[in-house]
Interface confidence: low
């Protein structure tokens, strides 16, 4: 299968260090289906996203591992990420809801939008943030959000601030950002698409 494992890994790799720590702590107390054991605390707390994914799959298998991961993410308040994880593991059943553009089928990692897949790289590498803001202003960003991003002193912190608003965005909103990135830093998008 493999798809569920990849989706779990994508979700965990998109957590911040603090969120990953919180995820592990919640995993220690989340209710489990009958017949499943708990990952030992000592091993769990030292794991990175990759090790944790492998452990989740070996302990709970792919389907239940993905479901359990989504439950913990939801419990952490990361509803969109949980939804994306479940969408990725059940992909192929029906069309996208009206008004929300389906993810491109060529996407390397199903269920995650390009800008979510490459969050860290975009924070690190986007230089033309002002251009992005102008492209998104009034369509995706409110005046308050626009000003909040502009107020940040460095490009990475501007991008980090911009990403703090994306959990509320649908695919169309994220596509607008991707389109703006293609227009302002096409080489960067192409580089990330190849990676």
């Amino acid at each position: 299968m493999g798809r569920a494992r990849d989706a779990i890994l994508d979700a965990l790799e998109n957590l911040t260090a603090e969120e990953l720590k919180k995820f592990k702590l919640k995993l220690l107390s989340v209710p489990l289906r009958e017949g499943y054991g708990r990952i030992p605390r000592g091993a769990l707390l030292s794991m990175d996203a990759l090790d944790l994914t492998d452990k989740l799959v070996s302990f709970y298998l792919e389907t239940y591992g993905a479901e359990l991961t989504a439950n913990v993410l939801r419990d952490m308040g990361l509803q969109e990420m949980a939804g994306q994880l479940q969408a990725a593991t059940h992909q192929g059943s029906g069309a996208a809801p009206a008004g929300i553009q389906a993810p491109p089928q060529s996407a390397a990692k199903p269920g995650l939008h390009f800008i979510d897949q490459h969050r860290a790289a975009l924070i690190a590498r986007v230089t033309n943030v002002e251009w992005l803001l102008d492209a998104l202003y009034g369509k995706v960003l409110t005046d308050e959000q626009y000003q909040a991003v502009r107020a940040e002193p460095t490009n990475p912190s501007k991008m980090r601030k911009l990403f703090s608003f994306t959990p509320a965005w649908n695919w169309t909103c994220k596509d607008l950002l991707l389109q703006a990135l293609r227009e302002s830093q096409s080489y960067l998008v192409e580089d990330l698409e190849r990676s």
């Epitope: 260090a17 790289a121 690190a124 590498r125 230089t127 490009n155 990475p156």
Partner: antibody, heavy 120, light 112 residues
Framework: QVQLKESGPGLVAPSQSLSITCTVS????????VHWVRQPPGKGLEWLGV???????NYNSALMSRLSISKDNSKSQVFLKMNSLQTADTAMYYC??????????????WGQGTSVTVSS | DVVMTQTPLSLPVSLGDQASISCRSS???????????LHWYLQKPGQSPKLLIY???NRFSGVPDRFSGSGSGTDFTLKISRVEAEDLGVYFC?????????FGGGTKLEIK
């Protein structure tokens, strides 16, 4: 493994300029920022500036007029240039990697430093 | 610029003792994104600084669990539960919430 190594002239005459190169290995400059920090003999650390992964820069405002940071991603090198040096610029100069990839958002690896003495 | 004030300047300890270093900033280090970018570094004699704690309380990889960071807003503390000989050196706090990034003056941990 991650390594940063500074190379500089050692001795610089007053009013002359300083050029230091930071050569990195074990990571890509397209994914990580590099900061410059200096430490006068027996004193504390002073942040000079940073070049982010995308190439944009930020400087310590007190030094901005005579400081410039650039890089060559393909050669894995970051360059610090400072003009009009005075004896107060005598210090150990360090480059340090800035990690956002793992969400540390701190200077997680430092070079061993290069000593710069400003003297005639 | 944000001024970082560390106390004490020098901290004589006996091996096995607990050590505590305080760091105070001239303005809040809580970023608008909710994170607090306060870090601790250790510089051993003749070496470059090494990252110990990032974002207030997170131990960097390979850092022993006897090191812990705490605090919020403008007041932060680094604690070493049982000082070992390899812990001796100068400890610096640093903030990266506001540009320019700034460091504390350092606290020298030495044997009593």
């Amino acid at each position: 493994q991650v390594q940063l190594k500074e190379s500089g002239p050692g001795l610089v005459a007053p009013s002359q300029s300083l050029s230091i190169t930071c050569t990195v290995s074990g990571f890509s400059l397209t994914s990580y920022g590099v900061h410059w920090v200096r430490q006068p003999p027996g004193k504390g650390l002073e942040w000079l500036g940073v070049i982010w992964a995308g190439g944009s820069t930020n400087y310590n405002s007190a030094l901005m007029s005579r400081l410039s940071i650039s890089k060559d991603n393909s050669k894995s090198q970051v360059f610090l240039k400072m003009n009009s040096l005075q004896t107060a610029d005598t210090a150990m100069y360090y480059c340090a990697r800035w990690d956002y990839v793992n969400s540390y958002e701190a200077m997680d690896y430092w070079g061993q430093g290069t000593s710069v003495t400003v003297s005639s | 610029d944000v001024v970082m004030t560390q106390t004490p300047l020098s901290l004589p300890v006996s091996l096995g003792d607990q050590a505590s270093i305080s760091c105070r900033s001239s303005q809040s280090l809580v970023h608008s994104n909710g994170n607090t970018y306060l870090h601790w570094y250790l510089q051993k004699p003749g070496q470059s600084p090494k990252l110990l704690i990032y974002k207030v309380s997170n131990r960097f990889s390979g850092v022993p669990d006897r090191f812990s960071g705490s605090g919020s807003g403008t007041d932060f503390t680094l604690k070493i539960s049982r000082v070992e000989a390899e812990d001796l050196g100068v400890y610096f706090c640093s903030q990266s919430t506001h540009v320019p990034y700034t460091f504390g003056g350092g606290t020298k941990l030495e044997i009593k």
